[in-house]
């Protein structure tokens, strides 16, 4: 059976696959997925290894019409470096010389300057080029190589290994060499895979059942460290509770060097955030941090300095801490908008079982704003999801120059933000550079400001506008007609109506169904519309919902079916990759994120059309 990294190299014109007959003869044969000699895989960014021989495809020189054969894999050799050129061409790196079928006289695969059909190769059984099954570096744990990546294939006791192995061990632990020749270099590490006993790589907090992995001997950049955690179905550490910080202070007390954690300000337009999307509500900065120097966008925990946090350049090489298991956040069920019939008094706006009101004109210090909201039967607003934030910004009359109190504050416990209405903190959206909370400026309260309504901490004594929120009454005379302008069964959002197509359909069938309804497969123009659609389909049991995006017209260029410009994307990790196809929204944990699927897969879908009675805004001029 093929493992997911392996593939057969297929020439469509001849309907044959590459076959490594021997190290000196790389030819073609009728495709056979069970033949080891036809299996290949990427073993670095640019090397392709024969699974049968554990040798790499290469050439004797970068010249036209030389035979491509197998060589001992050498990551430094220019003659083994391949790259995908446009479409399905595979070429030697840096040259216009391509992997070619050969001809009647020449049975061997050749390096050739021609780029016709005989130089075009796909992964057998797919329409993808060879790079779509690319190499993913595997970062090692423990060992003596500072967390370096596995070098495949590697030599151990004069035998070649193309995968992690338990050779030399009686306990089943999997390891790899981090250079091609373990026998000479003696550099190795353990693989970030599941095997018996691998749980001893983790420390489990008995109180929360969350597990932590301290990789103090590694030396990786922040992005590499994050990748290493993700390879173990974990994430870089987030800290949202004081207890969690205390536990980690104890866990790292014997160490001295900094360790990467998930805190970063890598998002261009927003502030500090955790990579696992936990809310940034607890602060434990080292005095003087975060420094405002440009480029210092990633954060390390300093065991030698009481485990406090410091922002550094993300390319620095440090150890790191991974975290997995139950989130430390309290479980808090946020009702989706459609679940709750919402009835509100005059001048209050309904959303998901609550009523909201902006007080813009009567400016008050935070304490007085809170008192007013409570007198009205509510509280300063708490915000628990991007959808709720989107509702406040898009439907409550929020204006880009507003600066309005919300309920978040750290008055009770310094550096630990809480909602004034007592609900748990499950979501934060800080402005760039926020929360700044400088010690010489007591900034214990939080405002929403700017065009996106992101948040900043602020001194509580500033007189500002504010947003109140209260639980809606279960019934009342004033029912707001939200779906005006939409047919029965369609849902209104801003100027559009949306409908879930409940028949499992291919992309083409879904598109046709929407057209039959005088609509089209949904476009997604900005993060607010994305937030709405996430709340619309994100909690549904089906895995995917088609959108109108695909690259079926021009491979590699994604377009909406209605030929609107693509101005916003929300790709899932590793997407769109190099796979051609049609785009569907995920549900569940990855709710709303976009995946590229084969267009003939069957999924539900979302149709969209202009609401009736809505004046179309002018198209933006370019």
């Amino acid at each position: 059976l093929l493992d997911t990294r392996q593939f057969l190299i297929y020439n469509e014109d001849h309907k044959r696959c590459v076959d490594a007959v021997s190290p000196s003869a790389v030819q073609t044969a009728a495709c056979n997925q069970d033949a080891e000699s036809q299996k290949f895989r990427w073993v670095s960014e640019s090397q392709i290894m024969s699974v049968a021989f554990k040798l790499c495809l290469g050439v004797p020189s970068k010249t036209d019409w030389v035979a491509i054969t197998l060589y001992a894999c050498d990551s430094k050799s220019e003659f083994q470096k391949w790259e995908c050129k446009n479409d399905t061409l595979l070429g030697i790196k840096g040259e216009d010389l391509f992997f070619n079928y050969g001809n009647r006289q020449e049975k061997n695969i050749m390096l050739y300057k021609g780029s016709g059909l005989w130089s075009r190769w796909k992964i057998y059984g797919t329409t993808d080029n060879l790079c779509s099954r690319g190499y993913e570096a595997m970062y090692t744990l423990l060992g003596n190589a500072n967390g370096a990546t596995c070098a495949f294939p590697f030599k151990f006791e004069n035998k070649w290994y193309a995968d992690c192995t338990s050779a030399g061990r009686s306990d089943g632990w999997l390891w790899c060499g981090t250079t091609t020749d373990y026998d000479t270099d003696k550099l190795f590490g353990y693989c970030p895979l599941k095997f018996e006993g691998s749980e001893s790589l983790w420390n489990k907090d008995p109180l929360t059942s969350v597990s932590y992995q301290i990789n103090s001997k590694s030396a990786l950049t922040w992005h590499q460290a994050r990748k290493s955690c993700q390879q173990q179905n974990a994430e870089l550490l987030s800290i949202t509770e004081i207890h969690e910080q205390t536990y980690l202070t104890g866990l790292t007390s014997s160490l001295t060097s900094g360790l990467w954690i998930g805190l970063n300000s890598l998002s261009f337009n927003s502030g500090w955030q955790w990579s696992d999307r936990s809310p940034f509500r607890y602060l434990n900065w080292l005095p003087g941090s975060p420094s405002a120097e440009p480029g210092k966008s990633c954060v390390s925990l300093n065991p030698g300095k009481n485990a406090k946090w410091e922002n550094l350049e993300c390319v620095q090489k440090l150890g790191y801490i991974c975290k997995k298991g139950n989130t430390t956040l309290n479980s808090f069920v946020i009702p989706s908008e459609s679940d709750v019939p919402t009835h509100c008094p005059s001048q209050w706006w309904p959303y998901a079982g609550h009523c909201y009101k902006i007080h813009r004109d009567e400016k008050k210090i935070q304490r007085d704003a809170l008192t007013t909201c409570r007198k009205e039967g509510g509280d300063l607003t708490s915000i628990h999801t991007i959808e709720e934030l989107d509702f406040i910004i898009s439907q409550l009359g929020y204006e880009p120059n507003d600066e309005l109190w919300i309920g978040l504050n750290d008055i009770k416990i310094q550096m630990y933000f809480e909602w004034s209405d007592g609900t748990p903190v499950t979501f934060t959206k800080w402005l760039r550079g926020e929360p700044s909370h400088e010690n010489n400026r007591q900034e214990d309260c939080v405002v929403m400001k700017g065009k996106d309504g992101y948040w900043a901490d602020r001194g509580c004594e500033w007189p500002l506008g504010y947003i109140c929120k209260m639980k809606s009454r279960s019934q009342g005379p004033e029912i707001v007609e939200v779906e005006k302008g939409c047919r029965k069964g369609w849902k209104k959002h801003h100027f559009y109506c949306y409908m879930i197509g409940h028949t499992l359909s291919t992309f083409a069938e879904a598109n046709q169904t929407c057209n039959n309804e005088n609509a089209y497969l949904t476009t997604i123009e900005d993060r607010y519309e994305q937030a709405f659609l996430t709340s619309f389909v994100g909690l549904r049991p089906e895995k995917y919902f088609w959108t109108g995006l695909s690259d079926i017209q021009t491979k590699g260029t994604f377009q909406w079916t209605i030929e609107e410009e693509v101005r916003f994307t929300h790709w899932n990790s590793d997407m769109p990759g190099r796979k051609p196809g049609c785009v569907a929204m995920r549900t569940g944990i990855a709710g709303g994120l976009w995946d590229v699927l084969k267009c003939d897969e069957k999924a539900k879908f979302v149709c969209k059309h202009w609401a009736e009675g809505v004046t179309h805004p002018p198209k933006p001029t370019t």
């Epitope: 061990r169 009686s170 306990d171 373990y182 190795f188 353990y190 018996e196 001893s200």
Partner: nanobody, 120 residues
Amino acid sequence: QVQLQESGGGLVQPGGSLMLSCAASGNIFTINRMGWYRQAPGKQRELVAAITSGGNTNYADSVKGRFTISRDNAKNTVYLQMNSLKPEDTAVYYCNAAIVTMTSPYSDYWGQGTQVTVSS
């Protein structure tokens, strides 16, 4: 480097008892399995008993019900309590451990051996 230090061997009468212990030291991340093997003169080395880090044990049929293996993970130590000893238990007893180290992918380490003689 990793070392295994055995103790507790000696001369004992049939029906008597002995307790062997073996402590591992050195560059150790974790010990996955610890066990005891024995080798009588002119015979192959054979497994006596082994214990995983989670406490799962297995025994040679010839010692079941008489020998008990246990370990103290905090001290990286394994014990073998031998009761109702018989003359055929006479052998050199070797401690063995499958250890995760930072220095080498090899896992199996052996002690020097301790002599157990059962004789009247």
